[in-house]
Interface confidence: low
Amino acid sequence: AWELTILHTNDVHSRLEQTSEDSSKCVNASRCMGGVARLFTKVQQIRRAEPNVLLLDAGDQYQGTIWFTVYKGAEVAHFMNALRYDAMALGNHEFDNGVEGLIEPLLKEAKFPILSANIKAKGPLASQISGLYLPYKVLPVGDEVVGIVGYTSKETPFLSNPGTNLVFEDEITALQPEVDKLKTLNVNKIIALGHSGFEMDKLIAQKVRGVDVVVGGHSNTFLYTGNPPSKEVPAGKYPFIVTSDDGRKVPVVQAYAFGKYLGYLKIEFDERGNVISSHGNPILLNSSIPEDPSIKADINKWRIKLDNYSTQELGKTIVYLDGSSQSCRFRECNMGNLICDAMINNNLRHTDEMFWNHVSMCILNGGGIRSPIDERNNGTITWENLAAVLPFGGTFDLVQLKGSTLKKAFEHSVHRYGQSTGEFLQVGGIHVVYDLSRKPGDRVVKLDVLCTKCRVPSYDPLKMDEVYKVILPNFLANGGDGFQMIKDELLRHDSGDQDINVVSTYISKMKVIYPAVEGRIKFSTGSH
């Protein structure tokens, strides 16, 4: 028998520095977690103790903090090289700055293979990108070889900016011939490493003949056997065992997100490359693991540029950006409108001639808007200003909801109106009218939404049975501020870009902004 240790990360999302337990900015260092310096300590410890170790990443290193905003992927290549990753799969967020934003900082600089079997380049891009990412890679490990085959969510064109010269194929269809090819090369130990979410990971384990292990990402799935060490609730045991269609037991793993855990899976293979046993658990990278001093020093050196960036002007406002709780928790506020407009703008993807865009709607809890911005400071808007407006370090995500769920959400928005509570919704691509003289649960008297399948966008009444795409904060997607109906009834959830980054990019693009209060939210009675 031959034993392999797979160390894995996924959905790190720019958390190069240690973070708080909830993966936001580290405040109290003695209770902080993760970060590349701490990760390196643990990886090195395992490399010294065990003979056959692979360090793999399942995508979405890009996007999530000011590190990515400033360094645009160069930081990912630099620190992944320093940690000596063995392979990485492309995630959807690796395309956030377009194909060029992937090629130059990451693909050309990485000293490890970057993989995806279901992304096919065409046209002029095919020769430009040739060899910079691969469908698979055969890695020598000790006296053996291991095949790693990559995959990426086929939804990427809806979630990011891969352009028109990359085709995202069905994962299973694309993986099978690559695995077959590896078999003909006498590679009998094959890991599928990819970024399509836990449900697809399980399907790959079930359907792709010859895959021995699946290491996934995208869904931020936390798996754990036994008593979990922090606040994440396991979606199942680690590893999650899938019985393949040809009767094999295939371990499937994922390691939550944000570099909080290091996935640790030990696999025992027989001489024919069959998995005899698999066991392990994610390792919580808490403060009991010291940060490696050399990596930490490097982080501090790279940090200097971030501090300078946060005080630079992104753009100007010529109006007061009213982010006060007195406004945003009671009525339409222009800060809410600005943020929602930025959220929609960030999700412009012209992927189908029938649609002007795939999504037109935004909702945003008023309680998530934590500060106004005064235009009297020369109109200057900085990252620092935006960090006061959006301090919680969330993401703006894409969900699919039925009209009936949206209706419930808007009823919840005003079910206890007047108490300055955070659930009052700010909107984009939505016109809502409330009648507060009616009983809670029956206060939405008009709810019109902006069409997407139209050449001239206009507002139509919400249809209860129709499925709509909506951009919203991850806080709401996870049921925050009492929006349990969203969490319970959403049909799809894809994590998006860092909230501050979305707004800062929009302001930089617009240069001068002047959001107005324009009748998105109305009250049919009272003096609101």
């Epitope: 909830d22 936001s24 606040k231 934590r370 500060s371 301090p391 049921g479």
Partner: antibody
């Protein structure tokens, strides 16, 4: 590490105004996301939340006591002040200040200060 | 006001045994519930937040469950230092606490 300490009079007369100060260390109320609240507990009874204040001056009060309460902060001194007007013997309680987490639960508490209302 | 009702008012259990404390909310508070332990002369300390998440440093014998209106705090194997008063608190609306359950040695 995070510490909070309450200070104020041990005895107040009925109808008087109570002023309590919470002095804290280990965090700053100018940091985005921080909040400090006040909770009281009459002898042998349950806890009752009174008020809290966020770093951005956002203030919340218990609706049943709102007319009597004022909360404020002095960021430079790391202090939060609660005033309660028109004190009554039923307001006799131990008054705690606590750091409010993102949602309204309290991870760090002061040791409490007993306030007796009596003539 | 959301009223939190705890039961029983007093619970007598032997060391090493399991203790189950209940808390009922007067309306749906989803999972926005915390549990605190308080010993005589001391401030409360948080054990559980968001109904089921153990706070940092809290022993694994403490666990929370429930959502909506019914919540439970379970102490799997009582240690001598666990005998105290336990309060639940909702934070779906402005915070309100239960009246407490006194856990005493049988």
């Amino acid at each position: 590490q995070v510490t909070l300490r309450e200070s104020g009079p041990a005895l107040v007369k009925p109808t008087q105004t109570l002023t309590l100060t919470c002095t804290f260390s280990g965090f700053s109320l100018s940091t985005s996301g921080m909040g400090v609240g006040w909770i009281r507990q009459p002898p042998g009874k349950a806890l009752e939340w009174l008020a809290h204040i966020w770093w951005d001056e956002d203030k919340y009060y218990n609706p049943s006591l709102k007319s009597r309460l004022t909360i404020s902060k002095d960021t430079s001194k790391n202090q939060v002040v609660l005033t309660m007007t028109n004190m009554d013997p039923v307001d006799t309680a131990t008054y705690y200040c606590a750091r409010r987490e993102r949602w309204a639960w309290f991870a760090y508490w002061g040791q409490g200060t007993l306030v007796t209302v009596s003539s | 006001e959301i009223v939190m009702t705890q039961s029983p008012a007093t619970l007598s259990v032997s060391p090493g045994e399991r203790a189950t404390l209940s808390c009922r909310a007067s309306q749906n508070v989803f999972t926005n519930v915390a549990w605190y332990q308080q010993k005589p002369g001391q401030a409360p300390r948080v054990l559980i937040y968001s109904a089921s998440y153990r706070y940092s440093g809290i022993p694994a014998r403490f666990s929370g469950s429930g959502s909506g209106t019914e919540f439970t705090l379970t102490i799997s194997s009582l240690q001598s230092e666990d005998f105290a008063v336990y309060f639940c608190q909702q934070y779906n609306s402005y915070p309100t606490f239960g009246q407490g359950t006194k856990l005493e040695i049988k």
